[in-house]
């Protein structure tokens, strides 16, 4: 913490300007009025403050706004945003997409994924839902940031907005997020024809249940291997060799090079070896011919 001193009369600050870069930390602390700083935040980013000086300015704002900064200040934080922790950001109430854009631009190229995730979360809370304008802003200024939101926040996405989401925006989404987004996407694209539907739904398929995957296998979609391997393990395991063959089409050949990776490995172990042999890939590890498969989980459920 910066020690308190009184401000020398000749150092008194009446406006935020370039002369402040020559102030020592303790002089900034003593001479800059927090209310003046807040009122003239739009000037701060144009001044080449050191990181140490920015620490002092942040300290000033923290004292003035212990419950969190108002949006008028947040919008103009500029490089001061780089000093914020997720805990700081959690106190904010942000509704303006201009504020979001400004801060996303500042954070670019810096290791701030936790701060950005918290900021986006605050915007969604502030706006009440993840609307189309917010999604458009995220996809334009922060590809992949959509996946930083919790499944609970993503549940506020109306299906009508799903069309604005691009495949690359979902690259970092986990299974729980795709579980939330997939039903919305299914609803959003339900009136599309077979091939057009598959192109649109493909990035969301990591949330698809087995019955939907089975249905896709009847539609000649030729799913690529990367998409197949993003499917839920529980959705893949019940598929038969014939269904996987139909689902992947020519890409089924790639199972050979991915046989050690989940869910391919787990799926192979559940297939009959003679069925696997029909794939013409030399896949090994299936259930030997003549063996009987007992599902003990069913017996346990009955006892």
């Amino acid at each position: 913490d910066v020690e308190r001193t009184t401000c020398p009369p000749e150092k008194e600050v009446h406006e935020i300007d370039e002369s402040l870069i020559f102030y020592k930390k303790r002089e900034l602390e003593a001479c800059v009025d927090a209310a003046l700083l807040a009122a003239q935040m739009d000037r701060v980013d144009a001044i080449p403050f050191t990181y140490e000086q920015l620490d002092v300015l942040k300290h000033k704002l923290d004292e003035l706004y212990p419950q969190g900064y108002p949006e008028s200040v947040i919008r103009h934080l500029g490089h001061l945003f780089l000093k914020m922790s997720p805990e700081d950001i959690r106190k904010w109430n942000v509704t303006s997409l201009e504020t979001l854009k400004a801060l996303l631009k500042v954070s670019k190229g810096h290791e701030m994924s936790a701060q950005v995730a918290t900021l986006i979360d605050r915007v969604v809370v502030g706006r009440g839902q993840l609307d189309k304008d917010t999604v458009d802003t995220l996809t334009a200024f922060c590809p992949g940031c959509l996946c930083s939101l919790s499944p609970e926040r993503l549940s506020s996405v109306p299906p009508s907005v799903i069309g604005a989401v691009r495949p690359q925006d979902l690259d970092t989404c986990g299974p729980r997020q795709l579980d939330v987004l997939y039903p919305k996407a299914r609803l959003a694209f339900q009136n599309m024809s077979g091939s057009e539907y598959f192109v649109k739904i493909r990035p969301f398929l990591g949330g698809a249940p087995t019955e939907d995957v089975k249905a896709l296998s009847q539609q000649n979609v030729s799913m690529d291997l990367a998409t197949f391997m993003k499917l839920r393990r529980e959705a893949v395991l019940p598929l038969t060799v014939a269904e996987v063959q139909k689902l992947l089409g020519p890409h089924v050949e790639g199972l050979k090079v991915e046989e050690q990776h989940s869910p391919v490995r787990d799926w192979i172990l559940k297939q009959r070896q003679d069925d696997l042999d029909t794939l013409g890939l030399g896949l090994q590890g299936g259930i030997p011919n003549g063996y009987l498969i007992l599902d003990l989980s069913v017996r346990e459920a009955l006892s």
Epitope: D224, L225, K230, K256, H261, S262, T278
Partner: antibody, heavy 115, light 113 residues
Amino acid sequence: QVQLQQPGTELVTPGASVKLSCKASGYSFTSYWMHWVKQRPGQGLEWIGNINPSNGDTFYNEKFKNKATLTVDKSSSTAYMQLSSLTSEDSAVYYCARGWLRDYWGQGTTLTVSS
Amino acid sequence: DIVMTQSPSSLAVSVGQKVTMSCKSSQSLLNSSSQKNYLAWYQQKPGQSPKLLVYFASTKDSGVPDRFIGSGSGTDFTLTINSVQAEDLADYFCQQHYTTPYTFGGGTKLEIK
């Protein structure tokens, strides 16, 4: 060692059909799919399609769907590609190649379509 | 279809020099589940059939000399030949096997000065 043997040349007249062969040896024929690739003089490579020798399933590049027909004879470990309604545009070197990685290639058959 | 773009189309170097060629794809070739890029490099010497050099963007096929190095991920890939030898005179093609139709780049012709 793995070998894919293809005849060196085929000379056919426009409008005719031709059946190119690719005899595999040195590995289990039904454990790798066979691919066919076209290369015109001084030009790049084009994937025509592939076939699963185990069950005969075929997949084609849309561009060659009405031009090429892929088959296999498991008993002789030979893959075939029939090309129909030949024109001068079909004059090229045709290669067979093994598996998803195309890790082994035949020497190629030079097809000349000329009257 | 995925478009594969190679550059330069040709280059001439002296024996012992290092050479770099580029291959760009119109969409990502990365399978994020297995962290494999579905990209291969082939060498085609004059009058011969193509030969697999590198697969998964950076894995050398058996018997390929150490001077051949594949690198890159997503959409941008590079084949580097450290200390070019006279026998490296050939066309070099990249190819994606992410999705059908599998497509090749136009090739880079390597000439020896």
